[in-house]
Interface confidence: medium
């Protein structure tokens, strides 16, 4: 099955690549025989995946007021056979608040 924790990315991140976390199949024994793919809005532009490890990075600054969560899909393929190792799965990346609209008194 798929293994991951909940994903958060800080809005207005101050680096050009923020490591969000890792998606992986529990069948992956680390010998680079699987390929991870990211699909959905923001895949390949706002978010990228390391095809070998399943590590996900944000490479664009995000504004929580514009969009507070992204729903993406993950695939993992056996390179030797080209077949899916796990069913395609949906997951969420939440944009965490940095209180840029604090209440005014």
């Amino acid at each position: 099955g798929w293994v991951w924790n909940q994903f958060f990315v800080p809005e207005e991140m101050n680096t050009t690549s923020h490591h969000i976390g890792q998606l992986r199949s529990d069948l992956d024994n680390g010998n680079n025989s699987f390929q991870y793919k990211l699909l959905g809005a923001g895949a390949g532009s706002t978010f990228i995946i390391d095809e070998r490890t399943g590590d996900i990075y944000a490479i664009q600054k995000l504004d929580r007021e514009e969009r507070s969560l992204y729903i993406l899909r993950a695939q993992v393929i056996d390179i030797a056979t080209g077949r899916a190792v796990e069913p395609e799965s949906e997951f969420v990346i939440k944009v965490s608040d940095i209180n840029d609209n604090e209440p005014k008194f």
């Epitope: 680096t15 050009t16 690549s17 490591h19 680390g30 680079n32 390949g44 532009s45 990228i48 390391d50 095809e51 070998r52 490890t53 590590d55 990075y57 490479i59 664009q60």
Partner: antibody, heavy 120, light 111 residues
Framework: QVQLVQSGAEVKKPGASVKVSCKAS????????MSWVRQAPGQGLEWMGI????????TYAQKFQGRVTMTRDTSTSTVYMELSSLRSEDTAVYYC?????????????WGQGTLVTVSS | QSVLTQPPSASGTPGQRVTISCSGS????????VNWYQQLPGTAPKLLIY???QRPSGVPDRFSGSKSGTSASLAISGLQSEDEADYYC???????????FGGGTKLTVLG
């Protein structure tokens, strides 16, 4: 803040080996690839290879295959680049640079550089 | 010879707009994101533009990047004396399975 601090300048004889270190701080060491890029005097930048500090996986540029070895020590957040069978053309400044995952990730932070001089 | 072709030099006067080109092929610029680095004399390179047209924080909006087909370009508007540096394009090459850099362009700010 992210910092990459490299070892000091080296002078080597032709045929010898050199090992340059790059100590990372200010981020999760195992979450980002590290590349090595060199620059000969008055010349452009040349990518040598990459290491993933988490698993230690490496990819080397064809030109350096068989002569370069990249390793890492996760306990000290340090990556190493060893170049063997040195020749005068290997005289260059060697940089470590964070990033370089296939297709997308850029080199966002660079070490200060290590000058390696190969001379008899 | 570099896989990516850049003009060896470029120049302009303060306030002018200068463009530096980077020409590649389908296996590099045609398929992947382009990054640009600035190297001031005697210092390490610094990321200037990433994923074709994104600026890291701290890089003035005078710098912009674009990509079309197998070519990319870096534009610098409102040229300033501190922009005098070497500029390199870089991209992953699928055929070589590695990163390639352009030969670099030395930018001179005249007057």
């Amino acid at each position: 803040q992210v910092q990459l601090v490299q070892s000091g300048a080296e002078v080597k004889k032709p045929g010898a080996s050199v090992k340059v270190s790059c100590k990372a701080s200010g981020y999760t060491f195992t979450s980002y690839y590290m590349s090595w890029v060199r620059q000969a005097p008055g010349q452009g930048l040349e990518w040598m290879g990459i290491i993933h500090p988490s698993g230690g996986d490496t990819t080397y540029a064809q030109k350096f295959q068989g002569r370069v070895t990249m390793t890492r020590d996760t306990s000290t957040s340090t990556v190493y680049m060893e170049l063997s069978s040195l020749r005068s053309e290997d005289t260059a400044v060697y940089y470590c640079a964070r990033g370089g995952i296939k297709l997308w990730l850029h080199f966002d932070y660079w070490g200060q550089g290590t000058l390696v001089t190969v001379s008899s | 010879q570099s896989v990516l072709t850049q003009p060896p030099s470029a120049s302009g006067t303060p306030g002018q707009r200068v463009t530096i080109s980077c020409s590649g092929s389908r296996s590099n610029i045609g398929s992947n994101f382009v990054n640009w680095y600035q190297q001031l004399p005697g210092t390490a390179p610094k990321l200037l533009i990433y994923t074709n047209n994104q600026r890291p924080s701290g890089v003035p909006d005078r710098f912009s990047g674009s990509k079309s087909g197998t070519s990319a370009s870096l534009a610098i508007s409102g040229l300033q004396s501190e922009d005098e540096a070497d500029y390199y394009c870089a991209v992953w090459d699928d055929s070589l399975n590695g990163w390639v850099f352009g030969g670099g362009t030395k930018l001179t700010v005249l007057g």
